[in-house]
Each structure stands twice: as structure tokens, then as C-alpha cells.
Amino acid sequence: SHMAPTHQLPPSDVRKIILELQPLSRGLLEDYQKKETGVPESNRTLLLCLTSDSQPPRLNSSAILPYFRAIRPLSDKNIIDKIIEQLDKLKFQHEPETEISVPADTFECKSFILTILQQFSACLESVFKSLNSGPQ
């Protein structure tokens, strides 16, 4: 196949994917904040979105994907599907995905979703900065 295995993409292609993800993530977060005003960020949810074993940091797609699969029925499915599609391209092929359960309480659930979206946006910003600060 012409395409390199998805977990073997060079920094240039990773950067392309991050550039696609940024407006999707930003738009999803802004829409959710408008729709769910007054919902606080949860201090019980931590999205481990960066790998600790690579320099510069790599987006830990396998850790992020389960969260987006979990919140998909409760958010903008169309945008979430686009985000999942991009994250799949960055996933190491044989990395297992953990099962994530969304809080049953409505308010806690909204707080959980908001936290995921906020942390993901911050994470993309961090990875993008690291890709731009390389020896360019």
C-alpha cells in the first residue's frame, strides 16, 4: 500500500492531522460551553493525552479514543466521528483501548464531557507547539 502504517507517520503528517483536529476540537468545545452554561470542569477526570516515552511528546491516541467513543452518543456525533477518524490515524496498531464509562448523574456527566473537551483542546495545543518548535 502507498500509505505508511498509521503508527509510523512522520512529524509532517502528524502535524497535518493535528491541524485538522484543532478546529474540530475548538468548535466542539465552544458549542458545548454555549449549550451547557454554568457547568464546571470536573477535577476527577484526567485525560492522559500525551505519551511520556517520546520526545517531542506524541498524542496518546489510544488513551483518548475511548473517551470520545464514550461521549459520542451525548454530544455532536458528526464532529465526534470526524475526531475519532483523525485519532484512528495516529493510533499504534496493537495498543489496547480501555473501556470508559460516563457518569450516570446528568450534571456529573455534563461536567465530565466538558472536562474531556477542554483537556483535549489543551493537549492539541501542546503537541502542535512541540511540533513547531522542532528544528524547523
Epitope: 502507498h2 500509505m3 505508511a4 502504517p5 509510523q8 507517520l9 512522520p10 502535524r15
Partner: antibody, heavy 118, light 111 residues
Framework: EVQLQESGPSLVKPSQTLSLTCSVT????????WNWIRKFPGNKLEYMGY???????DYNPSLKSRISITRDTSKNQYYLQLNSVTTEDTATYYC????????????WGQGTSVTVSS | DIVLTQSPASLAVSLGQRATISCRAS??????????MHWYQQKSGQSPKLLIY???NLESGIPARFGGSGSRTDFTLTIDPVEADDVATYYC?????????FGGGTKLEIK
């Protein structure tokens, strides 16, 4: 078969804007990445930037303040605008497709020669 | 930016002989065992044509006389045997890091 065709003025005056069109047939610009590359008279090739399937753009930092790539999906065309041109922008301009991650630019237009001169 | 240095700048080879073109990158263009270096052929008055992608993969429709090898910073394009139709300028290009960059080109002539 995928075909790309550049068009636009062959002569541009210094300080003006260079505007080129790339017309694509045999593939949709709503998939893949669509690039501009130029070749200077001394044969040096320079990568300029791209517009993606979703409309995201990214440019060579050496041109960032002067370049803009846009598209019209209904016409299956994408465009290059280069502002404040100088004689140093005299080159043959190519459009090319980058179809798959981890691959290379597999289809190129035939190129259009642009001279910047008063 | 990653600088690609091609050598020689020009090359004259007899028909049926082997042509070898070198491309050296200022830093590694490898990730997880893949080399993001590609080779193009540009004939006079034509656009560049992809020959080899990811260092050693022959593009569809390209004759097996063309071959690519190398990894990290050192890459080679080989044409064996050279035919009259191979007269052109050959360029290497890296897609490892932004901005993508090209080598200065090697002009192949027939002796």
C-alpha cells in the same frame, strides 16, 4: 486518471499580487492534500504550502506573510495568491496532489511560468 | 529546515551502464523504520514525475531499472541500465518534517 492544470498570468509587475488557479479532474479536492511548488530559474524547487480536503491550509514559513491558498469545491479548483511579489518570485509554478499519509506527491500539473518584471 | 544535498550536480553515463545519484539529508528522515525520502524525474519542459517513494518503493508504472536505497540521512537512486529516455534532472524530496524540501537536482546526460 488524475490531472492537474495550472493557469494564470505569465507576467506580473513587482509589488503586485500573483494569482494562479489549479483545476483538478479525476479526483475531488475534498480528499487528500493539494499543494503548490515552484521551480526557480536556477532549477531549485521550493515547497510553498497546501490546502487540505477540509480546507485547512499550511504554508512554508518563508512565505507565510505573503501566501494564501484557497479553493472552490464546486469547481474542483484551488488557488494560489502571492502578495508583494518581487523579481525573486519569477519561477515555474506547479500544483500537485499528496493523496495519502506517508506517501509522496504523485500527480503534478504541467507547470506555468510566471515572470515578475516591470 | 532539513537541507538535502545531492551529488553529483551532473552526471554523464554511457547507454547500458549504471547511474548512481546520492542525496544526503542534514538530519535523519526516518521514523519507526520508514524513510520519508522520495525521488522524482523531471524531463526538459515537463513536470516532476514520482519514481520512488519512501526511499525504496517503486511507483506504479515505473520501470524496474530504477531503484532506491538508503536510510536515516544517506540515500541513493540507481538507474541500471541507463536508457536514452532517462536524460533528465533527478530530485530527492523529504516529507519527514515541515517545510518539505528538495535536493538541488542531478542532471543526467548520455556519454
Amino acid at each position: 486518471e488524475v490531472q492537474l492544470q495550472e493557469s494564470g498570468p505569465s507576467l506580473v509587475k513587482p509589488s503586485q499580487t500573483l494569482s494562479l488557479t489549479c483545476s483538478v479532474t479525476g479526483d475531488s479536492i475534498t480528499s487528500g492534500y493539494w499543494n503548490w511548488i515552484r521551480k526557480f530559474p536556477g532549477n531549485k524547487l521550493e515547497y510553498m504550502g497546501y490546502i487540505s480536503y477540509s480546507g485547512i491550509t499550511d504554508y512554508n514559513p518563508s512565505l507565510k506573510s505573503r501566501i494564501s491558498i484557497t479553493r472552490d469545491t464546486s469547481k474542483n479548483q484551488y488557488y494560489l495568491q502571492l502578495n508583494s511579489v518581487t523579481t525573486e518570485d519569477t519561477a515555474t509554478y506547479y500544483c500537485a496532489r499528496y493523496g495519502n499519509y506517508g506517501y509522496a506527491m504523485d500527480y503534478w500539473g504541467q507547470g506555468t511560468s510566471v515572470t515578475v518584471s516591470s | 529546515d532539513i537541507v538535502l544535498t545531492q551529488s553529483p550536480a551532473s552526471l554523464a553515463v554511457s547507454l547500458g551502464q549504471r547511474a548512481t545519484i546520492s542525496c544526503r539529508a542534514s538530519e535523519s528522515v526516518d521514523t519507526y523504520g520508514n524513510s520519508f525520502m522520495h525521488w522524482y524525474q523531471q524531463k526538459s519542459g515537463q513536470s516532476p514525475k514520482l519514481l520512488i517513494y519512501r526511499a525504496s518503493n517503486l511507483e506504479s508504472g515505473i520501470p524496474a531499472r530504477f531503484g532506491g536505497s538508503g536510510s536515516r540521512t544517506d540515500f541513493t537512486l540507481t538507474i541500471d541500465p541507463v536508457e536514452a529516455d532517462d536524460v533528465a534532472t533527478y530530485y530527492c524530496q523529504q516529507s519527514y518534517e515541515d517545510p518539505w524540501t528538495f535536493g538541488g537536482g542531478t542532471k543526467l546526460e548520455i556519454k
